[in-house]
């Protein structure tokens, strides 16, 4: 269509097409006609003399783009109790549900909503929550480095440094803190040596860990049982 604004409906000139974003070509009328704006649908298609008649979407229905739909789309069903609504259903947009705090999305659908909100994995003693997450948003566990420990099973706790002792009673390891000996009053004049305990070797498997996608290093998945899958998850 030439650069000037043309009111619909109009017959496209040879070699020109309708303006694709807000117009469509009606084969029956052989005219360029107006699409309906977001939030509306086609009540009556155009003809040679009158343009498209649009109407508002009804409750719980929407259209998100300029369209020539005969009906609006249905909004996704209400969010479940495992989810929170992050975008409401309006005439112009679908409802979007996300996982509630303490959960991650193990299966995201193309509507943008989550089909499977799973509890965040827990890292067992000797393992802390890594600073990065798996691509699906789940917790990643990492073995506590020398000088650090975690004695909890948690989806939030990181490895913490061992306490520093003047006199070391029991060295710490990956899953326990160091134990300091009580200071003897008779030794108070002696220069002190500070002890930072070194951990014992740690076990290499996190507990209750859900996966990230297959292109990342696999993490063992288990629900309190011997894991059988090193799980990868992904939405569409």
């Amino acid at each position: 269509v030439p650069a000037q604004v043309v009111l619909t409906p109009y017959k496209p000139e040879p070699g020109y097409e309708c303006q694709i974003s807000q117009e469509y070509y009606d084969r029956k009328a052989q005219m360029c006609c107006a699409k309906c704006p977001p939030g509306q649908y086609v009540k009556h298609f155009c003809n040679k003399t009158s343009d498209t008649v649009c109407a508002d979407c009804e409750a719980s229905m929407y259209t998100q783009v300029w369209n020539q739909f005969r009906t609006c789309l249905s909004c996704s069903s209400s969010c479940t109790t495992d989810q929170v609504e992050i975008r409401a259903c309006t005439k112009q947009q679908n409802r979007v549900c996300a996982c509630e705090a303490g959960r991650y999305c193990a299966l995201k659908t193309h509507s943008g909503s989550c089909r499977q909100c799973m509890r965040l994995s827990k890292c067992g003693p000797g393992f802390g929550v890594a600073s990065s997450r798996a691509p699906n948003g789940n917790v990643l566990c990492k073995a506590c480095a020398p000088g650090t420990f975690s004695d909890t099973t948690s989806s939030t706790d990181v490895c913490r440094p061992h306490r520093i002792c003047s006199i070391l009673a029991i060295p710490g390891n990956a899953s326990t803190d160091a134990v300091c000996a009580p200071e003897s009053p008779t030794l108070s004049a002696i220069p002190r040596t500070l002890y930072v305990s070194q951990p014992e070797p740690t076990r290499s498997q996190p507990l209750d860990q859900e996966p990230g996608p297959s292109q990342t290093p696999s993490i063992l998945t288990s629900l309190g049982s011997t894991p059988i899958i090193e799980q990868s998850t992904k939405g569409g």
Epitope: A106, Q116, N136, N138, P213, G224, I229, Q231, G236
Partner: antibody, heavy 118, light 112 residues
Framework: EVQLLESGGGLVQPGGSLRLSCAAS????????MTWVRQAPGKGLEWVSD????????YYADSVKGRFTISRDNSKNTLYLQMNSLRAEDTAVYYC???????????WGQGTLVTVSS | QSVLTQPPSASGTPGQRVTISCTGS?????????VHWYQQLPGTAPKLLIY???QRPSGVPDRFSGSKSGTSASLAISGLRSEDEADYYC???????????FGGGTKLTVLG
């Protein structure tokens, strides 16, 4: 060792009801998503229903929606499938399973046969 | 008719390599969702064989492998053994149906 044991199957007349149970052990049941899958005699697998760990999210196949209800009792480590208005086409072995993240059923029960016939 | 199409049967002799296909559409495999494979030995419950296209659960021999490309996925079994005789099913999430879907199953026969 993970174990899933279904019970409650049997012969029922069309229009009748049945409640299947699935007793779970060997894993933290309250952390697990669960599912029911069925298999008609000599046929393939058909997904029936899913349930989230808390019981807050329930999903059904169109073929059973409005007739079947999935539920769980985390204190008893048991999954249920209440089946109402049964039809001949509901005749199948019903399996309960544990859903891993992203959807694969990583453990299956041995199944219980439901026969709907007059 | 199943949303995922599998050949009804496949066969091979011991030691051979056999491939089973699973063809879907743009609303399931082609949409990027992960494909899972199950093995069902005669008279038993299904068992997870491959998850997330190509991942093997612990205990599954590395003779079994999975792959995915476009709107199709395939399961390959190398070094075929008599105990591999079973039904094999693929499964994936389908966006347009808003449900899990299974292939119709492939009955694998080990000859000889």
């Amino acid at each position: 060792e993970v174990q899933l044991l279904e019970s409650g199957g049997g012969l029922v007349q069309p229009g009748g009801s049945l409640r299947l149970s699935c007793a779970a052990s060997g894993f933290t049941f309250s952390d697990a998503w669960m599912t029911w899958v069925r298999q008609a005699p000599g046929k393939g697998l058909e997904w029936v229903s899913d349930l989230s760990d808390s019981g807050g999210s329930t999903y059904y196949a169109d073929s059973v929606k409005g007739r079947f209800t999935i539920s769980r009792d985390n204190s008893k480590n048991t999954l249920y499938l209440q089946m109402n208005s049964l039809r001949a086409e509901d005749t199948a072995v019903y399996y309960c399973g544990r859903l891993a993240a992203g959807g694969p059923v990583d453990y299956w029960g041995q199944g219980t046969l439901v026969t709907v016939s007059s | 008719q199943s949303v995922l199409t599998q050949p009804p049967s496949a066969s091979g002799t011991p030691g051979q390599r056999v491939t089973i296909s699973c063809t879907g559409s743009s609303s399931n495999i082609g949409a990027g969702y992960d494909v899972h494979w199950y093995q069902q030995l005669p008279g038993t419950a299904p068992k997870l064989l491959i998850y997330s296209n190509n991942q093997r659960p612990s205990g599954v021999p590395d003779r079994f492998s999975g792959s995915k490309s476009g709107t199709s996925a395939s399961l390959a079994i190398s070094g075929l053994r008599s105990e591999d005789e079973a039904d094999y099913y693929c499964s994936v999430w389908d966006d347009s149906l808003n449900s899990w879907v299974f292939g119709g199953g492939t009955k694998l026969t080990v000859l000889g």
